[in-house]
């Protein structure tokens, strides 16, 4: 039943019926279930095992109606022990000879069958009236997870018999279910830390410790929330949890004061073009507060006066930014600064970077196109465009010529070296219009194309000629 202790002898007189394993004759040698010890087991309760109120098996056959009720004997109802101790408890049952079919005893905890790793032994004590069975269960070095309600089950004549439970209550040092966590806080700003520990035994009382000194003189009941009014420097906090079994100390957590970040380091140029520079950096220490964004500062290095600084803002990650809209073939000084919620870091060391030469900014001028009928070629001439220093060194020209006639369209291009200002290209189609455009090329790239110059290629010897430097679109002069 549900009493905590073994039944009193007075109650035993009223309730007891049938043989008890604890009172088997001394000369009865037990026989063991497979894999069990052959050592004599102690009786369930030092000679005082007691039957439960029987829940008689409800069997239906005529023969089985004559069978006496069978039930597990009563055993101790409640065991309290400390963590890491060993514990043994048992179930016992007396099966009269009239019962033919019995299955092994299984152990259950909180409604789930205990399988595998648990250590249980079943032993059988036969006599002339039947057999007494003792199932011993042992746990070495109990843990909190062994807390629970244990009981036995057995099938007798296809009927499931269940014992009364044995409550196992494991007590130990307080066990933390919530420990304080490291936080980063603003200087002189209040914050909370939480600590929660449980038994059993309850209650669990909490002391807070800051830099090895107790914060609260009187303990607080778990869970405890410590409100720290503010800090000016890093501190280490922990909590002590006390119960009747002793004391457990939580991990120590660092509470850091948020500061401005350290400046970024290792600023590098990953790539340069005529008008952009790709810069990377390694963020400095974040000052215990996530970096929010970074600022790339750019100034022209060649200026004698302290020229204006261009500022480009970007997210803190990735640590990469392409500075655009720069002049070609120019030198720049670049530095990076990053910000967290407290403020901006100092700037990184300045580094020098250069843009490459640009593409030409103007097209070749005074373009003329002649048809040389005898050689069946177009003779193209132009004037070299005015190229600035930052546009780079002229390396050649690209000539685009498009041929159109009824039902035919052909788009071609040629590259010529910078030597001279003329070129010849073979006629591709007769009775067609040819449109010519020319662009200058430097190492920085290709410049804009000139306005188109059109020439009509006759079927025979007639020729329309259209000289043009920079004519209006579609303008055609005949000759």
């Amino acid at each position: 039943g549900g009493t905590a202790e073994k039944w009193e002898e007075t109650e035993l007189d009223q309730l007891f019926s049938g043989p008890l394993p604890g009172r088997l004759p001394v000369n009865h040698r037990p026989f063991s279930a497979p894999h069990s010890s052959r050592d004599q087991l102690p009786p369930p309760q030092t000679g005082r095992s007691h039957p439960a109120h029987t829940a008689a098996p409800q069997v239906t056959s005529t023969a089985s109606k004559l069978l006496p009720p069978v039930a597990f004997n009563h055993t101790i109802g409640h065991i309290v022990l400390s963590e890491h101790k060993n514990v043994k408890f048992n179930c016992s049952i007396n099966i009269p000879n009239t019962y033919q079919e019995t299955a092994g005893i299984s152990w259950w905890k909180d409604g789930k069958e205990l399988l595998g790793a648990h250590h249980s032994i079943t032993q059988f004590y036969p006599d002339e009236e039947g057999v007494s069975i003792i199932a011993l269960f042992s746990i070495a070095s109990v843990q909190r997870s062994d807390n629970g309600s244990y009981f036995c089950k057995m099938k007798v004549n296809n009927r499931e018999i269940v014992s009364d439970p044995i409550y196992v209550e494991v007590q130990g040092l307080p066990y933390f279910i919530k420990q304080p966590e490291s936080v980063n806080v603003t200087r002189n700003t209040a914050f909370n830390l939480t600590c929660q520990a449980v038994g059993p035994p309850e209650p669990v009382n909490i002391f807070w410790v800051q830099n090895s000194s107790r914060v609260n003189e009187k303990p607080e009941r778990s869970p405890s929330v410590l409100t720290v009014p503010g800090l000016t420097e890093t501190a280490v906090f922990s909590c002590e949890a006390h119960n009747d079994k002793g004391l457990t100390v939580s991990k120590g957590v660092h509470i850091n004061i948020k500061v401005i970040p350290s400046p970024p380091t290792e600023v590098h140029i990953l790539n340069s073009t005529a008008h952009s520079i790709l810069v990377s950096w390694v963020p400095g220490f974040d000052g215990y507060s996530p970096l929010q964004n970074c600022s790339i500062q750019v100034k022209e290095a060649d200026r004698l006066s302290n020229g204006s600084v261009m500022v480009f803002n970007t997210s803190a990650s990735p640590h990469l930014y392409e500075i655009q809209q720069l002049q070609a073939l120019a030198n720049y000084s670049i530095a990076v600064s990053c910000r967290n919620e407290i403020g901006w870091s100092a700037v990184s060391p300045w580094i020098l970077a250069s843009t490459t030469e640009g593409a030409p900014s103007v097209a070749p001028l005074n373009i003329t196109v002649f048809l040389n009928e005898s050689n069946n070629i177009l003779d193209i001439r132009w004037t070299k465009p005015p190229i600035k220093r930052q546009d780079g060194e002229l390396v050649g020209y690209r000539i685009s010529h498009v041929w159109e006639s009824a039902g035919t369209y052909k788009e071609l291009s040629e590259e010529v070296s910078q030597n001279g200002s003329w070129a010849q290209i073979p006629v591709q189609i007769h009775n067609a219009t040819c449109t010519v455009r020319i662009a200058a090329i430097t190492k920085g790239g290709i410049g804009p194309f000139s306005e188109p110059v059109n020439i009509i290629i006759p079927e025979h010897s007639k020729v329309d000629y259209a000289p043009s430097s920079t004519p209006a679109p579609g303008n055609t002069d005949s000759m």
């Epitope: 202790e5 009193e8 309600s149 014992s163 439970p165």
Partner: antibody, heavy 118, light 112 residues
Framework: QVQLQQSGPELVKPGASVKISCKAS????????IHWVKQRPGQGLEWIGW????????KYNENFRGKATLTADTSSSTAYMQLSSLTSEDSAVYYC???????????WGQGTSVTVSS | DAVMTQTPLSLPVSLGDQASISCRSS???????????LHWYLQKPGQSPQLLIY???NRFSGVLDRFSGSGSGTDFTLQISRVEAEDLGVYFC?????????FGSGTKLEIK
């Protein structure tokens, strides 16, 4: 979390019977004793008995033997108490409670009021 | 049966005062397994009883440390160090060492 939900109030005539229920949740119903307690208006508490739902075993306070019958339905995790041959003395609030691992009645139902009146 | 005698029946207190309730059993409540199964409950008006102290001196989960229990054998005491308004109600002791389980008659804690 452990909860015991009892059935609603009952108004019954003398000599009749009543069956009140206690639905358990939040733990293994078949593993813990359910106890029943009587409280008459403005009076103390009286222990009626227990049932272990895992095997149906019961134990009664002799004062309630023949008056109360305890049963349990494991499929619905519900314990029942039937009170028979009701008289005005049976008018009371009846509580179910779980006997927890600490061997105390740790969680209680909200109580069921039974009024016996003609 | 183990008869539980609880005193006083009524305990008028001022908020912030200490309160002490006694429970005496007609037989020892120490079980043969070494534990003493004497528990204390509070029943607030219109509510179910709630467990405060189990096995003489262990506070149940969530119970404030104003509540403490002591005693052994047959004599037990519940103490409330600083009474607050939320502590008002009827306090019962309960023994579960012997069948039938028996309750004390109750002590009503009320404001002076």
């Amino acid at each position: 979390q452990v909860q015991l939900q009892q059935s609603g109030p009952e108004l019954v005539k003398p000599g009749a019977s009543v069956k009140i229920s206690c639905k358990a949740s939040g733990y293994s119903f078949t593993s813990y004793y359910i106890h029943w307690v009587k409280q008459r208006p403005g009076q103390g508490l009286e222990w009626i008995g227990w049932i272990f739902p895992g095997n149906g075993n019961t134990k009664y306070n002799e004062n309630f033997r023949g008056k109360a019958t305890l049963t349990a339905d494991t499929s619905s995790s519900t314990a029942y108490m039937q009170l028979s041959s009701l008289t005005s003395e049976d008018s009371a609030v009846y509580y179910c409670a779980r006997l927890g691992l600490i061997y105390a009645l740790d969680y209680w139902g909200q109580g069921t009021s039974v009024t016996v009146s003609s | 049966d183990a008869v539980m005698t609880q005193t006083p029946l009524s305990l008028p207190v001022s908020l912030g005062d200490q309160a002490s309730i006694s429970c005496r059993s007609s037989q020892s409540l120490e079980s043969s397994n070494g534990n003493t199964y004497l528990h204390w409950y509070l029943q607030k008006p219109g509510q179910s009883p709630q467990l405060l102290i189990y096995r003489v001196s262990n506070r149940f989960s969530g119970v404030l440390d104003r509540f403490s229990g002591s005693g052994s054998g047959t004599d037990f005491t519940l103490q409330i160090s600083r009474v607050e308004a939320e502590d008002l109600g009827v306090y019962f002791c309960l023994q579960v060492t012997h069948v039938p389980f028996t309750f004390g008659s109750g002590t009503k804690l009320e404001i002076k």
